[in-house]
Amino acid sequence: DTEIKVNPPQDFEIVDPGYLGYLYLQWQPPLSLDHFKECTVEYELKYRNIGSETWKTIITKNLHYKDGFDLNKGIEAKIHTLLPWQCTNGSEVQSSWAETTYWISPQGIPETKVQDMDCVYYNWQYLLCSWKPGIGVLLDTNYNLFYWYEGLDHALQCVDYIKADGQNIGCRFPYLEASDYKDFYICVNGSSENKPIRSSYFTFQLQNIVKPLPPVYLTFTRESSCEIKLKWSIPLGPIPARCFDYEIEIREDDTTLVTATVENETYTLKTTNETRQLCFVVRSKVNIYCSDDGIWSEWSDKQCWEGEDLSKKTLLRHHHHHH
């Protein structure tokens, strides 16, 4: 009984198509597969960013796989051939591992890369990223931002930089069609006549960095002698009402502060007839239905009601928030 053996895949490599972190892992079938013509060979692929404790594992019949990586670090991957038990009289056979690595040769010292990179997707409409220059870089240093997401043919450079003292310190992005719910890759590199500048890579999903506009049209309605309903409206824009959570701050007679987080555009407050003044503000955030994370909006304009009218049936005063 001869032991069944199989070779590892050939020409295993990591290919960088220039998508700022979205890489292709590809390979060719192993040599000497003639004995297993009737068999469907599978491959077990393991890969990770160097320094990560866990490997991602994929079993596939294909000769390629694509995924996103952090190009600030190196990447390591290994693959072996699997022969299913149907091909080998009852036991799965594995080849030895083929291994490969990939990294971008770093230029410049780490301190030269941009600091405090911050990106916000305002009202799910306008993406703005800002950064600070690296430590100790000279004024002749300039930074350039490139970005890519699935759907673009190639990485694009920012065309509308925010500048300070002649240096690029941010980017206003154009309209980004079909760009949410997928990884968005950014590279900020730099150039200087005096010393090389280290590149920085960032990956996020746009729906998770949305900062909405504040709610508008805050109103009061007395429901009963001891209940007042607070209402507001969602701001103009592409975000539907079901995507919002709200935080309310209510102040009664300059003393009691009530805070609450709610899902709808109303909140019912228990009050007494003694209440003389009522003020509230609201802010909004994209909720778990539409994102994994988000940024609270600014607080709305404050809406107050004072005096005798508070005990009457309806208190309604529109107050438009100006942008």
């Epitope: 998770n208 778990i288 539409c290 994994d292």
Partner: nanobody, 115 residues
């Protein structure tokens, strides 16, 4: 037409446990969040727990530490594990799957906590 079907409700004694399931008939879980709501007689419907597409969770203060929400995108199913149940947890429990484009509700499953 996408449908959500809750199951797992029933009668349980105080201190007991139940696990609710919410199965979707279509592939709507991928980028949508999922939530569990409840409505007791004469009360407003309230969100008990929610989970985003990436697995971030939120809980109502009244169930924090007792209820756990989870999801299995491959099976298009969400779950609510309810431990240490109290009489005040008695309600009809509804699941919801929603996102920027979608908003679907189940028909509800009755949970009764009584000795």
């Amino acid at each position: 037409q996408v449908q959500l079907q809750e199951s797992g409700g029933g009668l349980v004694q105080p201190g007991g446990s139940l696990r609710l399931s919410c199965a979707a008939s279509g592939s709507i879980f991928n980028t949508n969040g999922m939530g569990w709501y409840r409505q007791a007689p004469g009360k407003q419907r309230e969100r008990v727990a929610g989970i985003s597409s990436g697995g971030n969770t939120v809980y109502a203060a009244s169930v924090e530490g007792r209820f756990t929400i989870s999801r299995d995108n491959a099976k298009n199913t969400g779950y609510l594990q309810m431990n240490n149940l109290k009489p005040e947890d008695t309600a009809v429990y509804y699941c919801r799957v929603a996102g920027r484009q979608d908003d679907y509700w189940g028909q509800g499953t009755q949970v009764t906590v009584s000795s």
